[in-house]
Interface confidence: medium
């Protein structure tokens, strides 16, 4: 049990100590108490280094002292001879005696109490790392302001964890910068910025001092970054070992200080700040960014505008702009959207004429129509180039995406004719000299092709037969023949409102305006052996001369027979219109005097019997255009006459031009518009 | 003609998970971001997140991180939607959908039913 | 997050009538707002997207308008299959964010 004070004394003391002993003492004062050991009285037989007989006292395995010889107190006052002070509450007390004493030695008295020891400073080491505070039996440890004291009881550390910075700029530095840092303490600081930023950390050199790392290189004290799974770090020494620039890519940064025990250095500081997180800026060829930066960075927001001709298509539709936004990951929000070309798709196909196959439908692509050559050319004079427009239209070079029109071309037999000049006497033709002639079956009757879906006829052929069945194509109008022709139907016949129409039409005086048109129910296709005649222009170069020739055909009566089944032809030249006044009309239905000329007709033939008759009315009188030599108009239709083979009337198609074109055009065929 | 074809229903015990998927045809998923959208009973539309099958990029609605997870597999051209930790507040039905500039095309729904 | 706010969960209107649906976002998101029409039992169908746009086949008695934080869905003559649940959708910034929807009932 320990004791607070106690007596030793040496064997048979104050007697003579016996030869031969060795006997030893445990001294034991309470915790916290050190212990007083002092002598009052040592006579024990001197040798050097006390070899012989001795008092050893031992704290542990650490010698204390060892006495030998005689002492006596320098102090009139006390009787202390000898003493040991130690900051232990245990101490061994081990007396020896070796085999023989030359005289005889009394030993020694000694006494020991507990006393009280000052921890603060009775030690090398301090046993608290900030404040000690001494006390009899003991000692406790305080600590700064700000500090607090560690489950040790002994070491104070700074309670620097916890503190999270979410603000876009700051400033974080060790406890107590630019002062030492506290000993045994771990710091942690947590950056938490909202999404879309990313840490960066600066430290300046001269803003680091931390304990240098040991010779093996571990760092004793350390600063350590962590960002999700990167880390900086450990640093340590004297300037700051790392980069000045900390770019974590996170938006998230924790900060570890970890110190050990000792240390004097002042610590470090460092700036922080959140970086909007970058886009890449993509240079593109195909669109416009608005606004226009050198850098975009989280929250930015840009129209993205595609250049004219490109879209961007999404399901079955197409939009030019769209916007996109810099997002918390650094990608663009909407980043599949790409302005790609406009795609035009197939061309549309024309009637009577052809497209090419596009090498692309893209963009900026080029197709070319075509009409069928020679029947066909393109109306308005285009050269057929189209081009996919930004629109997504194929356009014209006016930029109009109206398909080019193939119309038939007028007036050009493939064949010229070169038989007699006569119909009456009989001159075969082939169709492939009158493209344009069309045969009426009832009456028997001709008639000019002038337009796909239009026939010109004279007014006294249709006149009782509104629903005529027409042909085109065939020389022959034998029936077998006729079956392989192409048949024509009526949708509508239009009378000139200037025809009068008689209740007995074969006692007509009058054939003044005996012109009408046929409209089709569907369009002619032309061919070698059918094609349109041409319109008279409304100059005076379509003015008919005297001895101007012409060309009628038909099958009408010859003079063999009262109905040609093949095709006849004749070259005939205008006449003054008092010739056909001076013939003696046949007629015994009307009144020869009663016959009424106009301007609106023609007068033509009177030579070696050459004429047009009963079965070729509505024929075309055609003549071969002033300004296209190569083209034949129709000049008049084949009307009435006095008698066959003489001269023949012919209505003077030029009049009536302005009523042709009005009617073909109000009355157009809907899917051709 | 495009077209999501989503699997069939499911019914699950709390604290398991689920995976549905999305196959696509009439297009290659690679050149759109593929979407997924939960509808709880009676209730409105909440994005999940979306996947860019091309690069395997997601991004959640955060209040899915962690409860749902896109996948893709371009060779089959179908998205994955993987739910775990099922509670009955993920009792919904879930679309797929396509975009690039808005959700042109939707999958027919597959309904997941969480109940013990 | 955007908050988009469809004010009216339910309207009921009759056959034949104008009705009109709102919708507001808690911020700027220009024009990038889209109209979904859901049927009983079905997913959701597109009408509207930027705001303004009728997307294809989609007839042309429904119309959008609006930028900035207000937009507007019309149904300018009310038909009996148009019965249904209309949703406005921002697609500005994930996440993508939609309205509660609006329920037309037919008189």
């Known amino acids: 049990e320990p004791t607070m004070y106690g007596e030793i004394l040496s064997p048979n003391y104050p007697q003579a100590y016996p030869s031969e002993v060795e006997k030893s003492w445990d001294i034991e004062v309470p915790e916290g108490y050190g212990i007083h050991l002092y002598f009052t009285h040592l006579d024990i037989e001197l040798s050097e280094n006390c070899a012989y007989d001795s008092v050893q006292i031992m704290s542990g395995d650490i010698e204390e002292g060892r006495l030998c010889g005689q002492r006596t107190s320098n102090n009139p006052h006390s009787p202390i001879v000898e003493e040991f002070q130690v900051p232990y509450n245990k101490l061994q007390v081990i007396f020896k005696s070796d085999f023989s004493n030359e005289e005889r030695f009394t030993g020694f008295a000694a006494y020991y109490v507990a006393t009280d020891i000052n921890e603060c400073t009775d030690f090398v080491d301090a046993p608290c790392s900030h404040f000690c505070n001494n006390f009899i039996g003991g000692y406790f440890c305080s600590c700064p302001p700000e500090y607090f004291l560690h489950d040790d009881m002994k070491n104070c550390g700074v309670n620097c964890s916890g503190d999270v910075f979410t603000a876009l700029i700051g400033e974080i530095a060790s406890p107590n910068y630019p002062k030492p840092y506290p000993e045994n303490s771990r710091c942690e600081y947590q950056i938490r910025l909202e999404k879309g930023f990313q840490v960066v950390v600066t430290v300046r050199r001269e803003d680091f001092d931390v304990e240098p790392a040991d010779s093996e290189g571990n760092c004793l004290d350390s600063l350590v970054f962590v960002a999700g799974d990167q880390q900086f770090g450990p640093y340590c020494g004297r300037g700051f070992p790392g980069p000045l620039n900390i770019e974590t890519k996170s938006n998230a940064l924790d900060i570890i200080f970890q110190t050990d025990l000792t240390g004097q250095n002042k610590g470090w500081k460092l700036r922080y700040h959140g970086d909007p997180m970058p886009c890449p800026k993509e240079e593109t060829p195909t669109s416009v960014w608005e606004p226009a930066k050198a850098k975009y960075v989280f929250r930015d927001v840009v129209r993205i505008t595609c250049l004219d001709g490109f879209e961007v298509v999404e399901g079955r539709v197409g939009a030019t702009s769209f916007h996109s936004t810099c997002q918390s990951n650094g990608k663009w929000s909407n980043s599949k959207l790409k302005c790609q070309p406009v795609d035009c798709g197939i061309p549309e196909s024309i009637e009577n004429g052809k497209v090419e196959d596009p090498e692309s439908t893209l963009f900026g692509s080029v197709t070319r129509y075509t009409c069928e050559e020679p029947y066909y050319y393109m109306e308005n004079g285009g050269n057929g180039q189209y081009h996919c427009a930004s629109n997504g239209s194929w356009v014209n070079e006016a930029l109009s995406p109206e398909l080019p029109k193939c119309v038939p071309v007028c007036g050009v037999p493939r064949e010229p004719f070169e038989g007699k000049q006569r119909i009456i006497g009989g001159s075969d033709a082939d169709i492939k000299n009158f493209p344009w002639q069309v045969f009426f079956d009832n009456p028997w009757a001709g008639g000019a092709l002038i337009d796909e879906y239009w026939v010109l006829t004279a007014a006294h052929v249709v006149e009782g037969n509104q629903e005529p069945t027409m042909y085109v194509g065939s020389t022959s109008v034998q029936t077998s023949r006729l079956a392989k022709s192409k048949m024509l139907t009526s949708e509508r016949v239009f009378i000139h409102p200037g025809w009068k129409l008689l209740e007995v039409p074969e006692a007509r005086t009058n054939f003044d305006n005996d012109i009408a048109l046929v409209q089709l129910k569907d369009p002619v296709k032309m061919g070698p052996t059918v094609a349109p005649i041409c319109l008279p222009g409304t100059s005076s170069d379509y003015n008919l001369m005297d001895g101007d020739l012409g060309l009628i055909a038909g099958w009408g009566r010859t003079e063999k027979r009262d109905r040609a089944l093949r095709l006849k032809a004749a070259r005939l030249p205008v006449a003054p219109l008092r010739k056909c006044r001076e013939v003696k009309v046949e007629n015994p239905k009307a009144d020869a005097g009663a016959y009424v000329f106009t301007p609106n007709m023609i007068c033509a033939g009177g030579e070696k019997g050459m004429d047009s008759c009963k079965g070729d009315s509505g024929g075309a009188f055609a003549v071969q255009d002033p300004n296209d030599k190569a083209k034949f108009y129709v000049a008049g239709l084949v009307s009435w006459g006095p008698q066959c083979g003489t001269y023949g009337l012919y209505t003077r198609v030029q009049n009536y031009v302005d009523w042709i074109k009005k009617t073909m055009q109000e009355n157009s065929t809907p899917s051709k518009d | 003609e495009v077209q999501l074809q989503q699997s069939g229903a499911e019914l699950v015990r709390p604290g398991a998970l689920v995976k549905l998927s999305c196959k696509a045809s009439?297009?290659?998923?690679?050149?759109?971001?593929m979407h997924w959208v939960k509808q709880r009973p009676e209730q409105g539309l909440e994005w999940i997140g979306w996947?860019?099958?091309?690069?395997?990029?997601?991004i959640y609605d955060p209040k899915f991180q962690g409860k749902a997870s896109i996948t893709a597999d371009t060779s089959s051209n179908t998205a994955y939607l993987q739910l775990s930790s099922l509670t009955s507040e993920d009792t919904a039905v879930y679309y797929c959908?396509?975009?690039?500039?808005?959700?042109?095309?939707w999958g027919q729904g597959t309904l997941v039913t969480v109940s013990a | 997050d955007i908050v988009m706010t469809q004010s009216h969960k339910f309207m009921s209107t009759s056959v034949g009538d104008r009705v009109s649906f709102t919708c507001k976002a808690s911020?700027?998101?220009?024009?990038?707002v889209d109209w979904y029409q859901q049927k009983p039992g079905q997913s959701p169908k597109l009408l509207i997207y930027?705001?303004?746009y009728r997307y294809t086949g989609v007839p042309d008695r429904f119309t959008g308008t609006g930028s900035g934080t207000d937009f507007t869905f019309t149904i300018s003559s009310v038909q009996a299959e148009d019965l249904a649940v209309y949703f406005c959708?921002?697609?500005?910034?994930?996440?993508?964010?939609f309205g509660g929807g609006t329920k037309l009932e037919i008189k």
């Open positions: 959908a396509r975009s690039r500039l808005f959700f042109a095309y």
């Open positions: 009439g297009f290659n998923i690679k050149e759109y971001y």
């Open positions: 996947i860019d099958p091309e690069n395997g990029d997601t």
């Open positions: 911020q700027d998101v220009r024009t990038a």
């Open positions: 930027s705001a303004s």
């Open positions: 959708q921002q697609q500005y910034t994930t996440p993508y964010t």
